[in-house]
């Protein structure tokens, strides 16, 4: 059992091409940093894996369609939004996100767990920030993205709690 750090999340929901007045920010302390994650802030556009059956990102060939800076081929800073489960470990998911160029990995919990979060253990996958958020929050974000809403998340280090029991997948 180890201590766990919460994550402050500032999430923006923006309908593209409508201007800044349509941006809604939502501040909460609803995430927890992974046990092997760097304890540092990170921000980016949330990007789920391509394809309806790829939410768990357990296939090593999983891809992400990353938005680019307007008028260029330069990718914006982004965070992989991945669902827990599917037969692979947290480390597998986070490492894949890192390999694809993500600045961080946001893992959301299984369906049916509502807003429950757990401390993730992901030895070896230590290059990018990794947090877990609840299923309700993750599903809301995912559905927004699927409707064409761009969702940006700013993650900051919260408070220390613990000890909790670690989970690897």
């Amino acid at each position: 059992a180890e201590a766990v750090w919460t994550a402050y999340l500032n999430v923006s929901w923006r309908v593209p091409h409508t201007g800044v007045n349509r941006t809604v920010w939502e501040l909460s302390e609803e995430g927890v940093y992974g046990q092997d994650s760097p304890l540092e802030p990170v921000a980016g556009v949330l990007v789920p894996p391509d394809g309806p059956g790829a939410l768990n990102a357990c296939n090593p060939h999983t891809n992400f369609t990353v938005p680019t800076v307007w008028g260029s081929t330069v990718q914006v800073s982004w965070l992989a939004l991945i669902q827990r489960g599917g037969g692979c470990t947290f480390a597998d998911k986070i490492h894949l996100a890192y390999e694809r160029g993500a600045s961080g990995a946001v893992i959301f919990n299984f369906p049916g767990t509502r807003n429950e979060v757990i401390p993730m253990s992901h030895p070896g996958a230590v290059d990018i920030v990794a947090i877990m958020i609840g299923n309700l929050k993750g599903t809301k974000i995912l559905q927004s993205i699927q409707r064409g809403i761009q969702v940006t998340m700013v993650i900051e280090v919260g408070k220390k709690h613990g000890p909790w029991v670690n989970h690897y997948s």
Epitope: S12, R14, P16, H17, T18, G19, V20, T23, A43, V45, P67, T68, V69, W70, V76, S77, Q150, T152
Partner: nanobody
Framework: QVQLQESGGGLVQAGGSLRLSCAAS????????MGWYRQAPGKEREFVAA???????YYADSVKGRFTISRDNAKNTVYLQMNSLKPEDTAVYYC????????????WGQGTQVTVSS
């Protein structure tokens, strides 16, 4: 209404340096990203560099390692330090404010001319 005032352009010899500035005034929402684009004669406007609210910067491959973008949030100003300039950098440089996120069409300034002679 937003006003973007670019300055710092001019004529410089190849290998030289220039520093462009862009001061934004009017309605500026905390949370806008800023950047620079350029347009050479007879060519389309192209992305040069951008900076988000923190310290994340983005560069076109053609300027990476030579140009540096920075911002002063207190002054609502963005800068573009251009070193090792080449004749192909000659263009009108436009300041950009991304009111709708980095991925969407920005609001442009009037532009400042940069000419690099060989």
């Amino acid at each position: 209404q937003v006003q973007l005032q670019e300055s710092g352009g001019g004529l410089v010899q190849a290998g030289g340096s220039l520093r462009l500035s862009c001061a934004a005034s009017g309605y500026i929402f905390y949370g806008v990203h800023m950047g620079w684009y350029r347009q050479a004669p007879g060519k389309e406007r192209e992305f040069v560099a951008a900076i988000d609210l923190g310290t994340t910067t983005y560069y076109a491959d053609s300027v990476k390692g030579r140009f540096t973008i920075s911002r002063d949030n207190a002054k609502n100003t963005v800068y573009l330090q251009m070193n090792s300039l080449k004749p192909e950098d000659t263009a009108v440089y436009y300041c950009a404010v991304y009111f709708d996120g980095l991925t969407n069409l920005p609001y442009w300034g009037q532009g400042t001319q940069v000419t690099v002679s060989s």
